[in-house]
Interface confidence: low
Amino acid sequence: TIPPHVQKSVNNDMIVTDNNGAVKFPQLCKFCDVRFSTCDNQKSCMSNCSITSICEKPQEVCVAVWRKNDENITLETVCHDPKLPYHDFILEDAASPKCIMKEKKKPGETFFMCSCSSDECNDNIIFSEEYNTSNPDLLLVIFQ
């Protein structure tokens, strides 16, 4: 994906279909790459990213990565193709309308990642266990 500060003109209205035949617009995602964050020990956080980008490719979804080590906390917001691994992990929740953080095993740090498929959905990252992808109601949410 092209970062927003060097992004070329991108068609806002190009769409493709996924494996289920669902029609996809290019996502509008928060896209600040890696920034320091104060998000810690909260059920959910806002990204505090002021950059919204139209993803380069229609199949891309929004991704957020939260990392904590001994020195700092960072939050990464990007567009990414769910067919490709990100940070060596598959985006298994890419169809979700909300960005529900899941912990991943990374040595030397606490690492959470989420992906989602509605406009700017990586602006609100959710850690609370009450949101669980095994909950069938989750995928019915249409943000209204």
Epitope: D13, S117, I142, F143
Partner: antibody
Framework: EVQLVESGGGLVQPGGSLRLSCAAS????????MTWVRQAPGKGLEWVSV????????YYADSVKGRFTISRDNSKNTLYLQMNSLRAEDTAVYYC???????????????WGQGTLVTVSS | DIQMTQSPSSLSASVGDRVTITCRAS??????LNWYQQKPGKAPKLLIY???SLQSGVPSRFSGSGSGTDFTLTISSLQPEDFATYYC?????????FGQGTKVEIK
């Protein structure tokens, strides 16, 4: 119930300015991209501009680029269109419309306001 | 910009008739076409998106088909409330352009 109500239209002289507003209710405004579409008297529909839910991204039709500015105030659930350097050919009914989420209705405009008439004439 | 051409520009039909409106794109837009209905003095209403998907709340007598450059909106049995102007719109590339409209009038 989703509702979009435009206001701010009227008669303005060529070269003048006007600011349209669109008050939204019945849905969570801040996560929907919003568009303006216009229709000249007796003519067809013309897309004008789009703004992302946060307001961070905007796009414009070539015919209005540099003259019109789309913006939004999510705390007020309101969409705006600032129109400067108005021309006779900008005379139209201006509609605000909601862009659907892609897994909902693929970004087509699913809800429209009733429109507000802008007349540019000396 | 992609040009959208509708035909006919107007047609006269009776209640119960089967009505077909066509829309042609100046280049291939795959299946990325929407249909709207507009009545005089009213805002457009979304009928069909992605060429053939029926918008929620729209009667099943409306259907859409086509892909590439040629598309069709069909009203299987025209009802009194269907007399209106119909627009196609491509959502393949920016700007999302509309056809010039087809006015369906009472015969």
């Amino acid at each position: 119930e989703v509702q979009l109500v435009e206001s701010g239209g009227g008669l303005v002289q060529p070269g003048g300015s006007l600011r349209l507003s669109c008050a939204a209710s019945g849905f969570r405004f801040d996560i929907y991209a919003m568009t303006w579409v216009r229709q000249a008297p007796g003519k067809g529909l013309e897309w004008v501009s789009v703004i992302s839910g946060s307001g961070g991204t905007t796009y414009y039709a070539d015919s209005v680029k540099g003259r019109f500015t789309i913006s939004r105030d999510n705390s007020k659930n309101t969409l705006y269109l600032q129109m400067n350097s108005l021309r006779a050919e900008d005379t139209a009914v201006y509609y605000c419309a909601r862009r659907g989420q892609y897994r909902d209705i693929v970004g087509a405009t699913d809800y429209w306001g009733q429109g507000t008439l802008v007349t540019v004439s000396s | 910009d992609i040009q959208m051409t509708q035909s006919p520009s107007s047609l006269s039909a009776s209640v119960g008739d089967r009505v077909t409106i066509t829309c042609r794109a100046s280049q291939s837009i795959s299946s990325y076409l929407n249909w709207y209905q507009q009545k005089p003095g009213k805002a457009p209403k979304l009928l069909i998106y992605a060429a053939s998907s029926l918008q929620s709340g729209v009667p099943s007598r409306f259907s859409g088909s086509g892909s590439g450059t040629d598309f069709t909106l069909t009203i299987s049995s025209l009802q009194p409330e269907d007399f209106a102007t119909y627009y196609c719109q491509q959502s393949y590339s920016t700007p999302p352009t509309f056809g010039q409209g087809t006015k369906v009038e009472i015969k």
